[in-house]
Structures are given as C-alpha cells and as structure tokens.
C-alpha cells in the first residue's frame, strides 16, 4: 500500500490532522523535498547576516555577511570580520603584519616577503606590510655583455624573510 504522503510535493507537507492531505507550507517555512510530514522554519538573516536569497516554499533562505565581514562555515553559518590590508585577524582582533611579512587582502594571514636571493635575484622594490617585495634581475644579468633576455624564474610561494 503506497504511503499517501509520498504524493505531497516540495512546498507542501502531509497534514496528519487533515487526513494526510497535502497542505502548503505556512509562511516562513519550506519543504525542499516531497513526502515531508513537516515544513522547516526558514533561516532568518539578522544582525551581521544579510539575506542573499529569500526563503521560498521549496527552499531555505541563504545569508551572507554585511560589509566588513566575510562568511565562514557551511552555508555561511558565521561571519568573521575583515581586516585592512597589512593586517591579519588573530584571536584577539586585527593586528598589523610584523616586519618582513605582508598581507594584500582583507582576510588571511601575513606571509613572509619573498626572499629574492633564493632565486639569485636582487630586491628591486622593498616590501611593505601590504605588498610583497619585487625582485629585480640577478646581479649577473646586469653585468656587461650579459644577454638582455633571461628565462623567467619559476614561480614560488613567498619564502623566508630576507636575512
């Protein structure tokens, strides 16, 4: 014998109080699959959360974070504060990058400046809290008679701070 509730589509629930009739989900609730005996309460995006997608009878609301914050966790369950460039978020708030490190984004941690000497290159532009150093040509490239075209150095992650 087929369960009569299996005929209830998404956006409805199988109402036991009304002989298992398919009833529409009440306001501020939804059912995303058929055959449900209850509708789920819609998520409310309040405070530091803002609504990215409104709740419908068949799908939950989706939240993101207000400006100055970014999402963390499954389905943006948490909002973490942004920091300025040149800072990193610690357990005790935003802190400036230490000398020899940088962060060019509003999130993430400060990373060490690239060590140009590891590639045999010189520092063309010094690093700051917000920007990595820019490596220039190697000293050999600057000597008379050296080829004016040098193969590009392999890309590397920022290394250790300059000695």
């Amino acid at each position: 014998l087929q369960d009569p509730c299996s005929n209830c589509p998404a956006g409805t629930f199988c109402d036991n109080n009304r002989n298992q009739i398919c009833s529409p989900c009440p306001p501020n609730s939804f059912s995303s699959a058929g055959g449900q005996r209850t509708c789920d309460i819609c998520r409310q995006c309040k405070g530091v959360f803002r609504t990215r997608k409104e709740c419908s009878s068949t799908s939950n609301a989706e939240c993101d974070c207000t400006p100055g914050f970014h999402c963390l966790g499954a389905g943006c369950s948490m909002c973490e504060q942004d920091c300025k460039q040149g800072q990193e978020l610690t357990k005790k708030g935003c802190k400036d990058c230490c000398f020899g490190t940088f962060n060019d984004q509003k999130r993430g941690i400060c990373r060490p400046w690239t060590n140009c000497s590891l590639d045999g290159k010189s520092v063309l532009v010094n690093g700051t809290k917000e920007r990595d150093v820019v490596c220039g040509p190697s000293p050999a490239d600057l000597s008379p008679g050296a080829s004016s075209v040098t193969p590009p150095a392999p890309a590397r992650e920022p290394g250790h701070s300059p000695q």
Partner: nanobody
Amino acid sequence: EVQLLESGGGLVQLGGSLRLSCAASGFTFSSYAMTWVRQAPEKGLEWVSSISGSGGNTYYADSVKGRFTISRDNSKNTLYLQMNSLRAEDTAVYYCAKERTGTTGDYYYNVDVWGQGTTVTVSS
C-alpha cells in the same frame, strides 16, 4: 567524517551558569587543540577560549577570564565550557572548533572544522 556537535545552550538568568559540551568524532581527539568561539546577534565571531590537545594549556579572551573554564575529557572525546557569572553580553551562538595542530595559543586562528553551534541567551 569529522564532526563536532555542541549541546548545553539555553536560556539562563543574569549571573547564572551553564555548561556547554562538544562531542567530537571522526578524528583522534587528543591529538588536536580545540577552541570555543561565539557570535553575538549583531557582531562577528569572537574567540572565547582554547585548550591544547593534552589539556595542559588553556587560553582565554579577556572578556571571559575568571568566569569561563575550558576543559576536555579525551577518554570521552568531549570538550567543555563551564560558564559562570553570565552577563547579557555573553548572549551568542557558541561554536566549538577543531584546530589543525595539537598546540594552540591566543594569537592565531588555526581552525579547520566548525560545529553547528548552540545558542546561549542570558536574560535579566
């Protein structure tokens, strides 16, 4: 699958106490530091407390120091947060989180898994 499940939240009177629990599964619990963070209704995440994998080292935010106590029972794969002398500003969703290593501190967030959260409401 790594899972963290918080419980123990609820409505409590100003000055009252609550004990939150976080049941962990899917990883070697004693090998990892654990952290509690919270999110108040109008605010971003706030770090509350952290504990090393062995339980030997604990760290607290200034706002909860002397009122909250973090602990863990590695034989039960459970993290705890004992909250005393609760204030209105402690109202928040509390999340338990697994850190990436066994050691921790009060500087870096080093979290890779979050729980779903448990709500604590302090009423006057």
